[in-house]
């Protein structure tokens, strides 16, 4: 049902990464423009990218106000310049998205090393904190402030003049490794929520070598 | 408001099992760890394990690995502690705890109100 | 399995200040130990005062703060009332189990 020439959308897509979310769907309009309307389960709904030909919303002020709720959205589909039609029943003609619990699916983001150093045959790697768009007594939250303990990181090491791999892991943002004297190390990291069933893993970091700006050589 | 209510006292003879329910409300059920700690008459506090019932993601204390098990029922809000081969040492008063919003604040938030465990033969 | 200790018993004078702390046998206390403080008073349930080391529940007064004070966590009272008088446990996180203390009895008197 539904007015003439409108089709309501399909596909409705959660696209998340560290809390920044965006609702997409398709298809694009013609001559057809869209809202979405966003709840939690116990909720009002809160409409959103009103009357928009886009075909995604940015919903993120929505769910970082509480990242740990469940959250449903829905798509109304309205005839172009007519947006008081309605369907047959009285209603425009909507779709609703599967069901979103940021703390639980958003993506990880790429995490960045941000220094290391070295100290005799010891190797400090520090991992950036990003910030998130979680805020808390109007301050933004870390990505550990968020997840605190649920969140790990696992460190790829290996010798520059070879190919064998070695792993750590973290449950804070350094690491303190054990490395040979005189070999240049290269270092990759990745964030991991252990817990998890879905989107339990970020893409690896960028590699960083010893030897290049970012690190710090002390011969002790 | 975020409320645990657990089940009610239990005998059970050595080598019996018991299995202890926590119902949740006020909050989202799939988003929180929930904590098992026990105290037995005139002890401290000991956690047993955790589970995070959006993913039945559970950890465990390693005293009670092989004995304990911790289940989440989504459609009822509830969270289950069954521990096996009871013997006279586990007679406790059992707690369900939620944690805090967020991860800088991890750990215990609030707290059931306990079920007494009395292993007698 | 890490030991977590602290004082078996302390007494502070009503109105006064007292420190309880929390040791780790595996080194310093850090911020990613997440340190709890749970109060139990006789008869009664646990009630988490500060968790992740010096963030006060709701329901916690402002004469208790929790902090990192050298290589130990401690919890500070300020002002100290016949309530407080309790069982006072320390709870830290070390990579996938939580360990209890002992528990520190505070006598008000």
């Known amino acids: 049902s539904g007015t003439t020439n409108t089709v309501a959308a399909y596909n409705l897509t959660w696209k998340s990464t560290n809390f920044k979310t965006i609702l997409e769907w398709e298809p694009k309009p013609v001559n057809q423009v869209y809202t979405v309307q966003i709840s939690t389960k116990s909720g009002d709904w809160k409409s959103k990218c009103f009357y928009t030909t886009d075909t995604e919303c940015d919903l993120t002020d929505e769910i970082v106000k509480d990242v740990k709720q469940t959250y449903l959205a829905r798509v109304f589909s309205y005839p172009a310049g007519n947006v008081e039609s309605t369907g047959s029943a009285g209603e425009p003609l909507y779709e609703n998205s599967p069901e979103f619990t940021p703390y639980l699916e958003t993506n990880l983001g790429q995490p960045t090393i941000q220094s290391f150093e070295q100290v005799g045959t010891k190797v400090n790697v520090t991992v950036e904190d990003e910030r998130t768009l979680v805020r808390r007594n109007n301050t933004f939250l870390s990505l550990r402030d968020v997840f605190g303990k649920d969140l790990i990181y696992t460190l790829y090491y290996w010798k520059s003049s070879s190919s064998g791999k070695k792993t750590a892991k973290t449950n804070t943002n350094e690491f303190l490794i054990d490395v040979d004297k005189g070999e240049n190390y290269c270092f990759s990291v990745q964030a991991v929520i252990p817990s998890r069933t879905v989107n339990r893993k970020s893409t690896d970091s960028p590699v960083e070598c010893m030897g290049q700006e970012k690190g710090e050589f002390r011969e002790i | 408001q975020v409320q645990l209510q657990e089940s009610g006292a239990e005998v059970k003879k050595p080598g019996a099992s018991v299995k202890v329910s926590c119902k949740a409300s006020g909050y989202t059920f799939s988003s929180y760890w929930i904590e098992w700690v026990r105290q037995a008459p005139g002890q401290g506090l000991e956690w047993m394990g955790e589970i995070l019932p959006g993913s039945a993601s559970t950890k465990y204390n390693e005293k009670f690995k092989g004995r304990v098990t911790m289940t989440a029922d989504t459609s009822t809000n509830t969270v289950y502690m069954e521990l096996s081969s009871l013997r006279s040492e586990d007679t406790a008063v059992y707690y369900c705890?939620?944690?805090?919003?967020?991860?800088?604040?991890?750990?215990?938030?609030?707290w059931g109100q306990g079920t007494l465990v009395t292993v007698s033969s | 399995q890490a030991v977590v200790t602290q004082e078996p018993s302390l007494t502070v004078s009503p109105g006064g200040s007292v420190t309880l702390t929390c040791r780790s046998s595996t080194g310093a206390v850090t911020t990613s130990n997440y340190a709890n403080w749970i109060q139990q008073k006789p008869g009664q349930g646990p009630k988490t005062l500060i968790s992740?080391?010096?963030n006060r529940g709701p329901w916690t007064t402002a004469r208790f703060s929790g902090s990192i004070l050298g290589d130990k966590a401690v919890l500070t009272l300020w002002g100290a009332h016949a309530e407080d008088e309790a069982d006072y446990y320390c709870?830290?996180?070390?990579?996938?189990?939580?360990?209890f203390g002992g528990g520190t009895h505070l006598t008000v008197q």
């Open positions: 709870a830290l996180w070390y990579s996938n189990h939580w360990v």
């Open positions: 705890a939620r944690d805090y919003y967020y991860g800088s604040s991890y750990g215990f938030a609030y």
């Open positions: 992740g080391t010096n």
